[in-house]
Interface confidence: low
């Protein structure tokens, strides 16, 4: 189920599947909650620890059971990710953080006249993933009211300072806040060209532009169909990104797919999870559990439920079969998405339902330790 | 790789292709990504090549004929082999990689955990070896990255196997009595994960072996646990962020 | 410098014994395997026996195995031969050496002793 | 066990002639195979290992060549020096040496 809480002064030992830089717990929550594999995270405030390399230090954890132990250190705030808690889930994040310096890649400077202005730019500018803004009181005067649009590889800043009168913050583009509008069209029959920034495996093209729409750094992406000639690139989802933001060229090519990412959608943007089942597919990856259900859509709830499942196969065939339940497996991979799709077998496979944000979770047991 | 079977895109996240650039450019090694910015792999792989100015790395790619004058790489800003590697010896043969830039973690660029310090009570018993290395004694560099599932051997057993070698504790072997599964040349370097606990870990480096795959001569392997002092030591004292490890 | 020193050789009867010593200076006696190699008046090379590093593992030519014990002692850095049931064909001239364990090459005999005589005769 | 058998058994030369000397093993011993030269009342030192590599300090007039069960020692161009017996030794399966090669003055 949905656990909010929050322990302060803890840090879970162990278990770390990535780490980064976030100005707050709540925002390295939300990393946890989009990250494929983590469950719990753990974030050292800067007034926490001394040492400057692992301040804002913002970690990922996964365990096989759920949970890791606990230490005590001061400042830290530990928790779990956001899976399953229904609308909770959002990718959007609209705080602003004063006194703090969010670097990375620093593509565009411009004089603006308010912190908002300058988040406003970023979230109407398609590369930009944060930005970083000099207030009139800045010590340097020639750096005075400079707003910096950033980018960074994945999508968090590469160090976070401490540093007076600079206030840094997010792109709006997940709270779909964009001015830049998105292309809803998918192109039949058409190969994108440029930087290929991940390559996952999808079963179908709407799958991939959901990965693409909530990969930091996907702006368009192209889907090789299943009857793809090359065998090893069937069911290839590869996420793009270019310069310019768009495609540089585009090449008519059978059995792919191409299209853009709708994080800057004006309106809402997809959940992100996919919930359609695939009748006659496979979805390879590691074992996690294999229990008899009744069912495909029982099998997905089952998968649901269980917070490390990712995806879902339910075999059809006689073998695999008790009376009215059959085997439901259940399943995980490194990144989230199946690592072999196979097609004409007898049973149907999909998703977790985890990262839907329409489940009602009504149980939000938010609690945080005593101050 | 002998006896291995094509691995699939972000299998082995943490994988990354060491290639030389002379006149013509080519795999010499393989490697583990252990941090945004650092690469373990062995020391023997720059035996005569410790310029880090003719290396190009290559991460999150499973096809290295995909690689093309436009595919990024990774510089090395420095090149760390072990104080206690000898050329003519087997013993340490490990060596960390800095990079001249921090590589971004996707779904196909991921570090590979690091054992504990000493780990010898951990019993694994799910382990593979990855390489774009020879598939026989004498054969080529394969294209797409392969992966063998191999058991542990005891230093005892892996003793006996190779009598003219002292096998230390520092080093630890894999391989099948019948042979025909094991690292060959240029897989060195690279990896030998385990899975422990649902955890994939770094166990040891692809090191040396009589042959490829002979029957009762393991592959050997640098014992990753034995050395965690000296990679915390090394990856933290050198400038620049260390691989984020839990500082619990 | 790295150097092997035999010693204990000498004239011995037909079903005697007698004890070799190899001294090891000069390197890291207890990392390589040791190597006991004769030579009989006028004749070739021959290999007698081999310990490696631990001690753990000793092996014999055919021609002694039964006969001669090789054994080690780490922390005096030498090496050693028991010589029993001696026969008149053991006479030679025993030299100890060293193999650098090289990895991935396998070396062959870098470093020999001078050697020492061992004369079976009644 | 692998027999090394080595052939000649002597051979005369002068200084200046390129020499060759044969070793063939009873087994495939892949490359495993060192060269030795032996002077009277000396130990043997090594010349060359792993069938062709030249042992540091070794002059390059010295070469080795083969793999599998045919190996060959050449001296390109006999020094005064050289006038000595040879071995070749199989490591391959524990150590075996050849019966050697005399090289003498012709």
């Known amino acids: 189920g949905c656990l909010t809480q929050l322990y302060e002064n803890a840090f879970f030992r162990g278990g770390d599947v990535a780490s980064m830089y976030t100005p707050n717990a709540q925002y390295c929550q939300m990393r946890c909650t989009f990250h494929p594999r983590c469950l719990l995270f753990s974030f050292l405030p800067a007034s926490s620890i001394n040492d400057m390399e692992k301040r804002f230090g913002c970690f990922l954890k996964d365990s096989v059971t759920g949970t890791l132990p606990k230490v005590h250190r001061t400042g830290a705030v530990s928790g779990h990710s956001l899976k399953q808690c229904g609308h909770q889930i959002s990718a959007c994040h609209r705080d602003i953080y004063k006194g703090v310096d969010m670097r990375g890649v620093n593509f565009n400077v411009s004089k603006v006249s308010s912190v908002e202005e300058c988040q406003k730019r970023c979230t109407s500018n398609i590369r930009c993933q944060f930005f970083s803004y000099a207030t009139q009181t800045f010590h340097k005067a020639e750096y005075r009211n400079n707003c910096l649009l950033k980018y960074s590889p994945g999508g968090t800043p590469t160090a976070i300072k401490v540093l007076s009168n600079v206030e840094s913050g997010f792109s709006l583009k997940p709270c779909a806040l964009s001015e830049i509008g998105c292309h809803m069209n998918i192109f039949q029959h058409l190969a994108f060209s440029d930087v290929d920034v991940a390559r996952v495996l999808t079963p179908d093209a709407f799958v991939c532009r959901t990965i693409c729409t909530y990969h930091p750094n996907c702006l368009f992406f192209t889907f090789y169909t299943n009857v793809w000639k090359i065998e090893s690139q069937r069911n290839v989802c590869l996420l793009k990104t270019s310069e310019s933001g768009t495609p540089s060229s585009s090449t008519p090519q059978e059995n792919t797919i191409s299209g853009y990412s709708l994080l800057t959608c004006k309106r809402t943007l997809p959940e992100p999870c996919h919930s359609k089942i695939y009748p006659g597919v496979d979805f390879g990856g590691e074992e996690l559990n294999v229990t008899f259900v009744k069912g495909v859509n029982v099998c997905q709830e089952t998968c649901t439920k269980m917070i490390r499942c990712q995806f879902f196969t339910y075999s059809l065939l006689p073998e695999d079969c008790k009376e009215e339940k059959c085997k439901c497996f259940l399943r995980l991979s490194m990144d989230g998405s199946p690592t072999r799709i196979a097609y004409g077998t007898q049973g149907s496979s999909g998703y977790s339902l985890r990262l839907c944000n329409t489940g009602d979770n009504s149980v939000c047991t938010t609690k945080t330790s005593t101050r | 790789i002998v006896g291995g079977t094509n691995s699939s895109w972000g299998e082995w996240p943490w994988q990354v292709s060491l290639q030389v650039k002379l006149t013509a450019q080519r795999h010499l090694c393989g490697g583990s990504l252990i941090g945004h910015q650092w690469v373990l792999t062995a020391a023997h792989c720059f035996d005569g090549l410790p310029l880090q100015d003719v290396w190009r790395i290559y991460s999150g790619i499973l096809n290295l004929s995909d690689i093309t004058k436009d595919t990024p790489f990774s510089q090395i800003k420095e090149i760390i082999i072990h104080q206690n590697y000898k050329v003519s010896e087997g013993n340490h043969d490990i060596a960390l990689i800095k990079l001249q830039a921090p590589l971004n973690y996707t779904e196909f660029q991921k570090p590979i955990c690091l054992p504990s310090k000493g780990d010898t009570s951990t019993i694994y018993t799910n382990c593979w070896v990855t390489g774009w290395g020879f598939s026989k004694e004498k054969g080529e560099i394969q294209n797409i990255l392969q992966k063998v599932n191999i058991p542990l051997v005891t230093n005892e057993e892996c003793q006996k196997r190779y009598q003219d070698y002292k096998i230390t504790q520092r080093m630890v072997c894999a391989g099948y009595k019948e042979g025909g599964k094991d690292a060959c040349k240029g897989d060195s370097g690279g990896p030998l994960v385990c899975k422990h606990n649902g955890m994939w870990r770094l166990v040891g480096i692809t090191s040396w072996g009589e042959g490829c795959a002979r029957r009762e001569q393991p592959g050997v392997y640098t014992k990753v646990a034995e050395y965690m002092d000296w990679i915390l030591e090394k990856t933290q004292s050198s400038d620049g962020k260390a691989q984020m490890q839990s500082p619990a | 410098e790295v150097q092997l020193l035999e010693s204990g050789g000498g004239l011995v009867q037909p079903g005697g014994s007698l004890r070799l010593s190899c001294a090891a200076s000069?390197?890291?006696?207890?990392?390589?395997?040791m190597m006991w190699v004769r030579q009989a008046p006028g004749k070739g090379l021959e290999w007698v026996s081999g310990i490696y590093s631990s001690g753990g593992i000793t092996v014999y030519a055919d021609s002694v195995k039964g006969r001669f014990t090789i054994s080690r002692d780490n922390s005096k850095n030498t090496l050693y031969l028991q010589m029993n049931s001696l026969r008149a064909e053991d006479t030679a001239v025993y030299y100890c050496?060293?193999?650098?364990?090289?990895?991935?090459?396998?070396?062959?005999?870098?470093?020999w002793g001078q050697g020492t005589m061992v004369t079976v005769s009644s | 066990d692998i027999q090394m058998t080595q052939s000649p058994s002597t051979l005369s030369a002068s200084v200046g002639d390129r020499v060759t000397i044969t070793c063939r093993a009873s087994?495939?011993?892949?490359?495993?195979l060192a060269w030795y030269q032996q002077k009277p009342g000396k130990a043997p030192n090594l010349l060359i290992y792993k069938a062709s590599t030249l042992e540091s300090g070794v002059p390059s007039r010295f070469s080795g060549s083969g793999s599998g069960t045919e190996f060959t020692l050449t001296i390109s161009s006999l020094q005064p020096d050289d006038f000595a017996t040879y071995y070749c030794q199989q490591y391959n399966t524990y150590w075996t040496f050849g019966q050697g090669t005399k090289v003498e003055i012709k």
């Open positions: 050496a060293y193999r650098r364990t090289g990895v991935p090459r396998r070396d062959s005999f870098e470093i």
């Open positions: 000069g390197f890291t006696f207890s990392h390589y395997i």
């Open positions: 087994q495939s011993i892949s490359s495993w």
